[in-house]
């Protein structure tokens, strides 16, 4: 059979080989398509309800005024010329429809390096056969399930037209230190060969590099946090990040009701000041980051180091903030 590819909605003429150019003709067209269950016979004399779909022209050709999905199938003509010689024509018809230009919707303007991000959703509407969508990064194909690339696809079919809508959602994990303005595009490749791909307009999201969080350092004076009664302890919270974050203080896991400050002074230490202290740095972009905890204890006269496990009451005593 001769393969014929026809665009949906366009007319198609199939020649009946060996048919006399004018009536009277002895010919018969048989079709087995989505509109038939077995073979439907059409003859030159037989104008009727099928004429809207396929009719025999005066020269014996079969005319399809507007090819549809249901016209895919086999078309055969059997003709006898004036000398009684029989000729058969056999066609396999496939139909196609090119969709509109694909589009990227819900596209991200910014991606974060090192974590998965949704780049956008590529949508193609009105194709037949379905075809495929593929993504490109800087002009090179992106392979799903490789190097932090994942793609979620969906195919829907219009209940009346039978045409397909394709959707493809791209997720990527940009590498740290990579291209700050990658170029993504998406292309539709038709299901039938010999038709070029359709590509979307590109998108160029910015890649934001989160600053690696350096540790919040808590320095205690005197070193070790052990002090004689009535002595002074100075706690300093050192945060390398710029701009300087807000520093809050915790004692025994409970926030101290004090204004933010990088330095906490405990003058005239008493038993109630004993406990575990830490500072919390709050960055506008990262959220809170807590330091290690240090233990403040009172050394009774004659003792060498901090009293083991002694924690004072919850009273704050006299606190000074620098």
């Amino acid at each position: 059979a001769q393969n014929i590819t026809a665009r949906i909605g366009e007319p198609l003429v199939l020649k009946c080989k060996g048919a006399p150019k004018k009536p009277p003709q002895r010919l018969e067209w048989k079709l087995n398509t989505g509109r038939t269950e077995a073979w439907k016979v059409l003859s030159p004399q037989g104008g009727g309800p099928w004429d809207s779909v396929a009719r025999v022209l005066p020269n014996g050709s079969l005319f399809l005024p507007a090819v549809g999905i249901q016209d895919e199938g086999i078309f055969r003509c059997q003709a006898m010329n004036r000398n009684g010689k029989e000729t058969k024509s056999n066609y396999r018809v496939r139909v196609y429809q090119i969709p509109g230009k694909p589009e990227i919707v819900d596209s991200a303007s910014e991606l974060t390096a090192g974590v998965p991000n949704k780049v956008g959703t590529c949508v193609s509407e009105g194709s037949y056969p379905a075809g495929t969508l593929s993504w490109h990064l800087d002009g090179k194909p992106l392979v799903p399930n490789e190097k932090g690339v994942s793609v979620k696809e969906q195919t829907r079919r219009h209940p009346e037209t039978g045409l397909f809508t394709l959707q493809s959602e791209l997720m990527v994990t940009p590498a740290r230190g990579g291209d700050p303005r990658p170029t993504f595009s998406c292309s539709f490749s038709p299901g039938l060969p010999r038709h070029r791909a359709l590509r979307t307009a590109p998108i160029q999201p910015r890649v934001w590099e989160p600053v690696p969080l350096e540790e919040v350092q808590l320095v205690v004076e005197p070193e070790g946090g052990a002090v004689a009664p009535g002595g002074t302890v100075t706690l300093t919270c050192e945060v390398p990040a710029q701009p300087s974050p807000q520093i809050h203080w915790m004692k025994d896991g409970v926030p101290l009701p004090l204004p933010p400050s990088p330095v906490l002074i405990l003058p005239e230490i008493g038993p109630q000041d004993q406990g575990t202290y830490s500072c919390v740095a709050t960055h506008s972009s990262h959220g809170p980051q807590e330091s290690r905890a240090v233990s403040i204890s009172i050394i009774e006269p004659g003792e060498e180091g901090p009293t083991a496990g002694s924690v004072g009451g919850s009273g704050l005593g006299t606190l000074a903030l620098a």
């Epitope: 038939t36 037989g46 104008g47 009727g48 309800p49 004429d51 809207s52 779909v53």
Partner: antibody
């Protein structure tokens, strides 16, 4: 909403002529074949004529061929049936209907107009 | 020409009954059969298209089936508003042919 409204029926004498009209609305008229169907009093439905969407091709049963002519004016969304050499047996309610080809069959009907042929 | 032989020509039934009407085509007409309901003094209304498909706005108690050249309209549970005359139509070939009709009356 699809609407088909027939007009032009009435009482005529045998041998005379009558022209029926059908005004269509609520759909893209030139996308559809159109058909006339009739129903004699107390009887069943009988196909009278069909026309393709462009108006280039017309179809009739033997009972009315050469006497009736179906036509359309796509600019006016109108369908017509010219009936000549009317006979008593043409007495019926004439319905305008959308369709007539294999894509639709017949789906929507007008309310009908009565044609009486009697002396 | 194709003949569409519709049976029965009339039937009496009660509300709630299951009703079956058949049209037999004299030759293969594929799936190209519609069913219509007509009430006295009114235009026909399409119920089923292409043998088995329910038309928009038609209650689901109506259904159509096909076996070769036999086409069946079934009303699963007859309602008071279903008492009417029913016609099949073959539209595979000209002349378009209607069945003779089935009048469904109240028992």
């Amino acid at each position: 909403e699809v609407q088909l409204v027939e007009s032009g029926g009435g009482l005529v004498q045998p041998g005379s002529s009558l022209r029926l009209s059908c005004a269509a609305s609520g759909f893209t008229f030139n996308n559809y074949w159109m058909t006339w169907v009739r129903q004699a009093p107390g009887k069943g439905l009988e196909w009278v004529a069909s026309i393709d969407n462009s108006g280039d091709n017309t179809y009739y049963p033997d009972s009315v061929k050469d006497r009736f002519t179906i036509s359309r004016d796509n600019a006016k969304n109108s369908l017509y049936l010219q009936m000549n050499s009317l006979r008593a047996e043409d007495t019926a309610v004439y319905y305008c209907a959308r369709g007539g080809d294999i894509t639709t069959g017949i789906d929507y009907w007008g309310q009908g107009t009565l044609v009486t042929v009697s002396s | 020409d194709i003949q569409m032989t519709q049976s029965p020509s009339s039937l009496s039934a009660s509300v709630g009954d299951r009703v079956t009407i058949t049209c037999r085509a004299s030759q293969d007409v594929g799936i190209y059969v519609n069913w219509f309901q007509q009430k006295p003094g009114k235009a026909p209304r399409r119920l089923i298209y292409r043998a088995t498909n329910l038309a928009d706005g038609v209650p689901s108690r109506f259904s159509g089936s096909r076996s070769g050249t036999d086409f069946t309209l079934t009303i699963s549970s007859l309602q008071p508003e279903d008492f009417a005359t029913y016609y099949c139509l073959e539209f595979d070939e000209h002349p378009l042919t209607f069945g003779g009709g089935t009048k469904v009356e109240i028992k």
